[in-house]
């Protein structure tokens, strides 16, 4: 699982890039995205 | 290795319903999120719908919101997708596609081809 | 809107290079893309998810003479030492969650001819 805080601390990512794994992780695990 | 397999194409008049099938094999099917995909003959790609891995959520683009369903059942390994009032222009070959933990469509099907036709 | 240009066309002889691009609307020149490869009468295959940094990561089964790198809102797809199995339509394409709504959109596509 990709944690809130390991995402917001990949330096270099664009906030889409950020978007985008967590809504690839949220498809897996059903993780609400709000 | 990963297969998906669509189903359930074929000619059908404006206005009527179709459902597609695409059996999945050589993956746990309910750990992954699910699309599909189309393509109109001699054109390009267009998103149609995405699935997360126990069906709870759904998307859509607007072009197809109200008339197409996505889902799923897990325990037959197999995506659906079931299109209502359809139009010519929804005539397309139609992939499902599996996600991955790094991309939404990794994995694809070789397509079933609907024809919407009077 | 989330928009994504593709040249129509490009063709390179067998065993050289080619440089396909995929061209952003600029508000959203920071974004990751995917590129995916159509041989004819097939089904589309992912090659790699691109960054803005150019970093990438490449699908199963996909050689390396296949790389990406980008420029601001270009992204790029090279592939070197063409083989006629190259021959091919590639798409690039982008995802984005706006209110918990998701949208993803394709490029038009781009027809390459590998001359013999």
């Known amino acids: 699982a990709v944690s809130e805080h390991q995402l917001l601390h990949d330096k270099g990512k664009s906030i889409q890039d950020l978007r985008r794994r967590f809504f690839l992780h949220h498809l897996i695990a059903e993780i609400h995205t709000a | 290795q990963v297969q998906l397999v669509e189903s359930g194409g074929g000619v059908v008049q404006p206005g009527r319903s179709l459902r597609l099938s695409c059996a999945a094999s050589g993956f746990t099917f309910s750990s992954y999120g699910m699309s599909w995909v189309r393509q109109a003959p001699g054109k390009g790609l267009e998103w149609v719908a995405t699935i997360s891995s126990g069906g709870s959520y759904t998307y859509y683009p607007d072009s197809v919101k109200g008339r197409f369903t996505i889902s799923r059942d897990n325990s037959k390994n197999t995506l659906y997708l079931q299109m209502n009032s359809l139009r010519a222009e929804d005539t397309a070959v139609y992939y499902c596609a599996r996600q991955t933990t790094m991309t939404y469509f990794a994995y694809w099907g070789q397509g079933t081809l609907v024809t919407v036709s009077s | 809107q989330l928009v994504l240009t593709q040249s129509p066309s490009a063709s390179a002889s067998l065993g050289a290079s080619v440089k396909l691009t995929c061209t952003l609307s600029s508000q959203h020149s920071t974004y990751t893309i995917e590129w995916y490869q159509q041989q004819p009468e097939k089904g589309p295959k992912y090659v790699m998810d691109?960054?803005?940094?150019?970093?990438?990561s490449t699908g199963d089964g996909i050689p390396d003479r296949f790389s990406g790198s980008s420029s601001g809102a270009e992204r790029y797809l090279t592939i070197s030492s063409l083989q006629s199995e190259d021959e091919a339509d590639y798409y690039c394409?982008?995802?984005?969650?706006?209110?918990?709504?998701?949208?993803?959109?394709f490029g038009g596509g781009t027809k390459l001819t590998v001359l013999g």
């Open positions: 691109l960054k803005q940094d150019g970093s990438h």
């Open positions: 394409g982008v995802g984005d969650t706006i209110k918990e709504q998701f949208v993803y959109v």
